[in-house]
Interface confidence: low
């Protein structure tokens, strides 16, 4: 009985198409597959950013795979050929591993790269990113931001920079069509006459960095002698009502502070007839049904009732 062996895939490589972290892993079939013409060969691919604890594992019949990586770090990948048991009259046969790595050689010392990068997708409409110059750069250093997401033909440069002292410290993005629920890649690089500048790479999904507008039209309605209903409206914009969580802060007679988080645009408050003053503010955030994370809006304007019988009055801002 001769032992069945299979070679690893050939020409295994990681290709950078210039999408700021979205890379192609590709390979060719192994040599000497003639014996297994009737067989569908599979490949087991493992890859990770260098320093990551775990490998991502893919089993595929294709000769390529695409995924996003953090280009601030190196990437390592390995692949081997799998012959299913149907091809070998017994157990699955695996080749040895073919391995490859990819790394963007860092230019410049770490101090030169941008600091405190912060991106906010205001009201699910306008993306704005800001940063501070590296702690080791002169005023002649300028930073440039490039971005890409699936749907763009190539990486685009920011066309509307925010400036301070002549340096780019932020970017206002144009309308980003069909850009949410997918990885959004950013590279901020720089140039200086004096020395090379370290590039920084960032990846996020836009729906996870949304900061909504605050709620509007806060109202009180007396529901019963001991209950008041607080109501408000969602702000204008593309975010549907089902995507909001709200936090309310209620102050009663300048003493009691109640905070609550709710999913609807109403909150019923237990109160007493002695209540002389009631004020509340609300803020909103995209909830877990629409995103994995989010940023609280600013607080709404304060709405107060003071000095009149709440049972006789409904207040509208």
């Amino acid at each position: 009985d001769t032992e069945i062996k299979v070679n690893p895939p050939q020409d295994f490589e990681i290709v950078d198409p210039g999408y700021l972290g979205y890379l192609y892993l590709q390979w060719q079939p192994p040599l000497s597959l003639d014996h297994f013409k009737e067989c569908t060969v599979e490949y087991e691919l493992k890859y990770r950013n260098i320093g990551s604890e775990t490998w991502k594992t893919i089993i595929t019949k294709n000769l390529h795979y695409k995924d996003g990586f953090d280009l601030n770090k190196g990437i390592e990948a390995k692949i081997h050929t799998l012959l299913p048991w149907q091809c070998t009259n017994g157990s699955e046969v695996q080749s040895s591993w073919a391995e490859t790595t990819y790394w963007i050689s860092p230019q410049g010392i770490p101090e030169t790269k941008v600091q405190d990068m912060d991106c906010v997708y205001y009201n699910w409409q306008y993306l704005l990113c800001s940063w501070k110059p590296g702690i080791g750069v002169l005023l002649d250093t300028n930073y440039n931001l490039f971005y890409w997401y699936e749907g763009l033909d190539h990486a685009l440069q920011c066309v509307d920079y925010i400036k301070a002292d002549g340096q780019n410290i932020g970017c206002r993005f144009p309308y980003l069509e069909a850009s949410d629920y997918k990885d959004f890649y950013i590279c901020v690089n720089g140039s200086s006459e004096n020395k090379p500048i370290r590039s920084s790479y960032f990846t996020f999904q836009l729906q996870n960095i949304v900061k909504p507008l605050p709620p509007v039209y806060l109202t009180f309605t007396r529901e019963s002698s001991c209950e008041i209903k607080l109501k408000w409206s969602i702000p204008l914009g593309p975010i549907p009502a089902r995507c909001f969580d709200y936090e309310i802060e209620i102050r009663e007679d300048d003493t009691t502070l109640v905070t609550a988080t709710v999913e609807n645009e109403t909150y019923t408050l237990k109160t007493t007839n002695e209540t002389r003053q009631l004020c509340f503010v609300v803020r909103s955030k995209v909830n877990i049904y629409c995103s994995d994370d989010g940023i609280w809006s600013e607080w709404s304007d304060k709405q107060c009732w003071e000095g009149e019988d709440l049972s006789k009055k409904t207040l509208l801002r």
Partner: antibody, heavy 119, light 111 residues
Framework: QVQLVQSGAEVVKPGASVKLSCKAS????????MNWVKQAPGQGLEWIGR????????HYNQKFKDRATLTVDKSTSTVYMELSSLRSEDTAVYYC????????????WGQGTLVTVSS | DIQLTQSPSSLSASVGDRVTITCRAS??????????MNWFQQKPGKAPKLLIY???RQGSGDPARFSGSGSGTDFTLTISSLQPEDFATYFC?????????FGGGTKVEIK
């Protein structure tokens, strides 16, 4: 978490060499420099040199340049320092310490290796 | 080489005291608008621990009672309210140019 584990204590004769190791874990090894620092018994701290774990570039204190050699093995995330032509004043604790860039300080240190030079 | 002179070389203080240690460099350690000055704490038999980098930025996880200030040639480490675990030796260190150099140390002892 970040860990720098250094090799054990050494007793060596004058004129001999010693090779100390520092194995790193818990971070992306090649993103950082590794420094070596000497502390003689009851004395202060003295910087020997550093090596870029990515490119292998080295910077030395001139005082140690002829006798200290820093090397890196990326496959095992280990940095080595070989000290040659040892003399009694080389008796000290030698520390490895990680550094990100010049302005960021040496933020994680190994436990130290005691080298005793004695005939 | 840049020489660093620390003062005092030792001091006695009580828990709760405000303690100030100074470090003077033989030439400016500023570059690119950064002061390349770091502060370390070392306890007997232990490796040094980074407290402050770039003159005034706190190391990760260090208590807020440690603060650094200064620029150019004169730098200060301040412990706002000395705690029992703060009795140790403190070193300044410059990283503006090779060779990196350390101050001689300041030993903080219990009064």
């Amino acid at each position: 978490q970040v860990q720098l584990v250094q090799s054990g204590a050494e007793v060596v004769k004058p004129g001999a060499s010693v090779k100390l190791s520092c194995k790193a874990s818990g971070y992306t090894f090649t993103n950082y420099w590794m420094n070596w620092v000497k502390q003689a018994p009851g004395q202060g701290l003295e910087w020997i040199g550093r090596i870029d774990a990515y490119a292998g570039e080295t910077h030395y204190n001139q005082k140690f340049k002829d006798r200290a050699t820093l090397t890196v093995d990326k496959s095992t995330s280990t940095v080595y320092m070989e000290l040659s032509s040892l003399r009694s004043e080389d008796t000290a604790v030698y520390y490895c310490a990680r550094g990100y860039g010049d302005a960021y300080g040496m933020d994680h240190w190994g436990q130290g290796t005691l080298v005793t030079v004695s005939s | 080489d840049i020489q660093l002179t620390q003062s005092p070389s030792s001091l006695s203080a009580s828990v709760g005291d405000r303690v100030t240690i100074t470090c003077r460099a033989s030439e400016s350690v500023d570059n690119y608008g950064i002061s390349f000055m770091n502060w370390f704490q070392q306890k007997p038999g232990k490796a040094p621990k980074l407290l402050i980098y770039a003159a005034s930025r706190q190391g990760s996880g260090d208590p807020a009672r440690f603060s650094g200030s200064g620029s150019g040639t004169d730098f200060t480490l301040t412990i706002s309210s000395l705690q029992p675990e703060d009795f140790a030796t403190y070193f300044c260190q410059q990283s503006k140019e090779v060779p990196w150099t350390f101050g001689g140390g300041t030993k903080v002892e219990i009064k």
